[in-house]
Interface confidence: low
Amino acid sequence: EEELQVIQPDKSVSVAAGESAILHCTVTSLIPVGPIQWFRGAGPARELIYNQKEGHFPRVTTVSESTKRENMDFSISISNITPADAGTYYCVKFRKGSPDTEFKSGAGTELSVRAKPSAPVVSGPAARATPQHTVSFTCESHGFSPRDITLKWFKNGNELSDFQTNVDPVGESVSYSIHSTAKVVLTREDVHSQVICEVAHVTLQGDPLRGTANLSETIRVPPTLEVTQQPVRAENQVNVTCQVRKFYPQRLQLTWLENGNVSRTETASTVTENKDGTYNWMSWLLVNVSAHRDDVKLTCQVEHDGQPAVSKSHDLKVSAHPKEQGSNTAAENTGSNER
């Protein structure tokens, strides 16, 4: 009679994490008598998965009634597969004896586990940056298998090309992680912008996972200042306004200086929001010209989001100020930027 063969028809089986894996094995003869055992891996370090004769294997069930005398099908089902179950499984025939001895092994079935990547987590720089600067964003996703994965970066739907991606570990593993760093150049219009990391994997069936970061948490748009003199409100009084435009975030403190001396300090509160997400604010100062004998240098000094103060000055020519009410020829705007 022809010698018994152990047939494992599937060279490989791919299963999604959480599903059951069926590993097929049949023998071609009932002789010699002896049990079947399933192992993961080969050699002395192989791991026993199932023993037909004895033992408790709660995740393993036989597909057919392997206890029947004439049974030649020793296929098994392993439930609740995880990435840790990946490997090559061997169906091995033993010859009955004391002890049983290994008679013949099947060629092996490689079990690969398809595990979904975790939701990508995008993180930006620790400190805010201003427009024209390049900032780095990182994206991480873990626990996927197989290793083949595609990661793409977008800013407001436009694909980014300046990024570096690594998949770890380099060698074989039960599951993998991906780490990518993208460089993004900030613009003044980026308060409402989003950076998106998109991960595509075979387990996601064409529906990629996305992680996002809002550039509002990263960007600082410094204000522009404009100091202007308004029409005279009353005799000897000049109204000077400081327009603080296009700043983000809102945290801003303004100080008025008259000839270098602090006149008033206030914090931006009732701001107006621009379409691009930046803010505008206006502060005014009423100057009593008659209280000054000499020209007055008015300075609007702004400290934005804890950054060094920026300022804009305006010179009031007191000597040229006529005393008639309603006159607006009293001052010249010689604004200059100072830090």
């Epitope: 083949d148 595609t150 793409k152 990024f163 690594n166 529906d207």
Partner: antibody
Framework: QSMEESGGRLVTPGTPLTLTCTAS????????VSWVRQAPGKGLEWIGI??????ITAYASWAKGRFTISKTSTTVDLTITSPTTEDTATYFC?????????????WGPGTLVTVSL | AFDLTQTPSSVEAPVGGTVIIKCQAS??????LAWYQQKPGQPPKLLIY???TLASGVSSRFKGSGSETQFPLTISDLESADAATYYC??????????FGGGTEVVVK
């Protein structure tokens, strides 16, 4: 930036053949490189890719076991393990737009492989 | 298995005319599609990526559109230099890195 294939020649069926793609003007550690072939009078057929910064490879399902892609710091090799007459084609190497963005903005001129008895 | 179907396989149009080539994916690939132009004896040349973004130096007469599974390429104001074979390519991960069968454009 440019790429050039070499190693194409007439071979007999079953004789392994290695094609080499030499890159210049960019670093292979930053970009994926794919191999694409085109049989005479036929369309383009993607074979596989080796990614930048690692030796990770991926193959078209039909190409697994028939081709092997490997690389050095400046070259990417394609080995046809056991050529058949159906492997007669012009073989192109192509640079991915970025690592992981696998459309191709730089192509080599191609190298012709003829498999015949 | 994933595939890309290009139609028609050949199209003829006069100088100054317009042709539309269609590329259909067997499953959704978002906007991960590129178009190439290939002339005899030359390697392909990238025309469009991300379904609709023109590659550097490519004429605006070439217009890609669509998403998910349907991707048309429109070539308007045809010139004799546009005579070539055009291929679409999906790059939605290596398992779907596939070229369409190609469309030959003949300019009269």
């Amino acid at each position: 930036q440019s790429m050039e294939e070499s190693g194409g020649r007439l071979v007999t069926p079953g004789t392994p053949l290695t094609l080499t793609c030499t890159a210049s003007g960019f670093s292979l550690s930053n970009y994926g490189v794919s191999w694409v072939r085109q049989a005479p009078g036929k369309g383009l057929e993607w074979i596989g890719i080796i990614y930048g910064g690692s030796d990770i490879t991926a193959y078209a399902s039909w190409a697994k076991g028939r081709f092997t892609i490997s690389k050095t710091s400046t070259t990417v090799d394609l080995t046809i393990t056991s050529p058949t007459t159906e492997d007669t084609a012009t073989y192109f190497c192509a640079k991915s737009y970025t690592n992981g963005m696998d459309y191709y903005n730089i192509w080599g001129p191609g190298t012709l492989v003829t498999v015949s008895l | 298995a994933f595939d890309l179907t290009q139609t028609p396989s050949s199209v003829e149009a006069p100088v100054g005319g317009t042709v539309i080539i269609k590329c259909q994916a067997s499953q959704s690939i978002s906007s991960y599609l590129a178009w190439y132009q290939q002339k005899p004896g030359q390697p392909p040349k990238l025309l469009i990526y991300s379904a609709s973004t023109l590659a550097s130096g490519v004429s605006s007469r070439f217009k890609g559109s669509g998403s998910e599974t349907q991707f048309p390429l429109t070539i308007s104001d045809l010139e004799s230099a546009d005579a070539a074979t055009y291929y679409c390519q999906s790059y939605y991960g290596s398992r779907s890195n596939v070229f369409g069968g190609g469309t030959e454009v003949v300019v009269k």
